[in-house]
């Protein structure tokens, strides 16, 4: 029997943000091709990214079918069809991914402050409810639709003239905070899922300050 230089994939890594989910692996192929398969614990294996020379595979379409399921993927290595490679029958080389539960593990994307409105000494700050690729009844669900009250937002706000930050929390997408009249404030928000053990927090949103476009002021 002959030999082949086919090598198994390694460093299989899930990269997932707001349920957009890509499996990455190494190495770059030389005289070989890959096929990815994905399954739930109780389901059948489904081939994706078939016969590819890429080292990443977008598995979003599969995981959004049920984001609370736990998924396993495996990457098969095959000798390319133009490679001289003959040996006795043998299963293709493959490597398993770590298990991945989207609901518990997808990273929370950087949130965006949609608007803020001042009325007297109160400011209403609204966080954009980001659309995900999770569908229900043919419509895409928002992050809030998917996570419900599991998702909270933390607001950091401070006077433009000072560095002392205050915080507020909400389990909706809106904050109503007290401010000093005549002062300009800056705002940043962070998405948080307190019940999680990993990937609990997003990165902070871009800072928005009063006196700029997104704001509105009423006496």
């Amino acid at each position: 029997s002959g030999t082949t230089n086919t090598v198994a994939a390694y460093n299989l890594t899930w990269k997932s943000t707001n349920f957009k989910t890509i499996l990455e692996w190494e190495p770059k192929p030389v005289n070989q091709v890959y096929t990815v398969q994905i399954s739930t614990k109780s389901g059948d294996w489904k081939s994706k990214c078939f016969y590819t020379t890429d080292t990443e595979c977008d598995l979003t379409d599969e995981i959004v079918k049920d984001v609370k399921q736990t998924y396993l993927a495996r990457v098969f290595s095959y000798p390319a069809g133009n490679v001289e490679s003959t040996g006795s029958a043998g299963e293709p080389l493959y490597e398993n991914s770590p298990e991945f539960t989207p609901y518990l593990e997808t990273n929370l994307g950087q949130p965006t402050i949609q608007s803020f409105e001042q009325v007297g000494t109160k400011v209403n700050v609204t966080v954009e409810d980001e659309r995900t690729l999770v569908r229900r009844n043919n419509t895409f669900l928002s992050l809030r639709d998917v996570f419900g009250k599991d998702l909270i937002y933390t607001l950091y706000y401070w006077k433009s003239s000072s560095s002392g930050k205050k915080t507020a929390k909400t389990n909706t997408n809106e904050f109503l905070i007290d401010v000093d009249k005549g002062e300009n404030y800056c705002f940043s928000v962070q998405a948080v899922i307190p019940s999680r053990t990993v990937n609990r927090k997003s990165t902070d949103s871009p800072v928005e300050c009063m006196g700029q476009e997104k704001g509105e002021f009423r006496e």
Epitope: T4, T35, S47, P79, S85, T86, E91, L93, Y94
Partner: nanobody, 114 residues
Framework: QVQLVESGGGLVQPGGSLRLSCTAS????????MGWHRQAPGKGLELVAV???????HYADFVKGRFTISRDNAKNAVYLQMNFLRAEDTAVYYC????????WGQGTMVTVSS
């Protein structure tokens, strides 16, 4: 060693059809890729089409819309339906199964000529 036996080749006129069949001598795992490559006179081996155990397919650009690959896991067989054949499809067509290694049939000749 897995033995692959092809059949169905022959002489056909341009625009005609042929169906190639390939059967393995032993059970082929559903994790194997099966498919077809071809080698035209004086040219190198090139991929035609491949299929996974669960029916996912990949075609070379030059056959898309003309050729259809299918697989019967129970029969350890793979098929290639070739329609709208052209003179440039003339080649030896090799059945292929890939697991840990590549396995090849002996080839079947397809000649497209008027």
């Amino acid at each position: 060693q897995v033995q692959l036996v092809e059949s169905g080749g022959g002489l056909v006129q341009p625009g005609g059809s042929l169906r190639l069949s390939c059967t393995a001598s032993e059970t082929i795992s559903s994790t194997y890729i099966m498919g077809w490559h071809r080698q035209a006179p004086g040219k190198g081996l090139e991929l035609v089409a491949v299929i996974s155990g669960d029916g996912v397919t990949h075609y070379a650009d030059f056959v898309k819309g003309r050729f259809t690959i299918s697989r019967d896991n129970a029969k350890n067989a793979v098929y290639l339906q070739m329609n709208f054949l052209r003179a440039e499809d003339t080649a030896v067509y090799y059945c292929y199964a890939a697991g840990r290694w590549n396995h090849w049939g002996q080839g079947t000749m397809v000649t497209v000529s008027s």
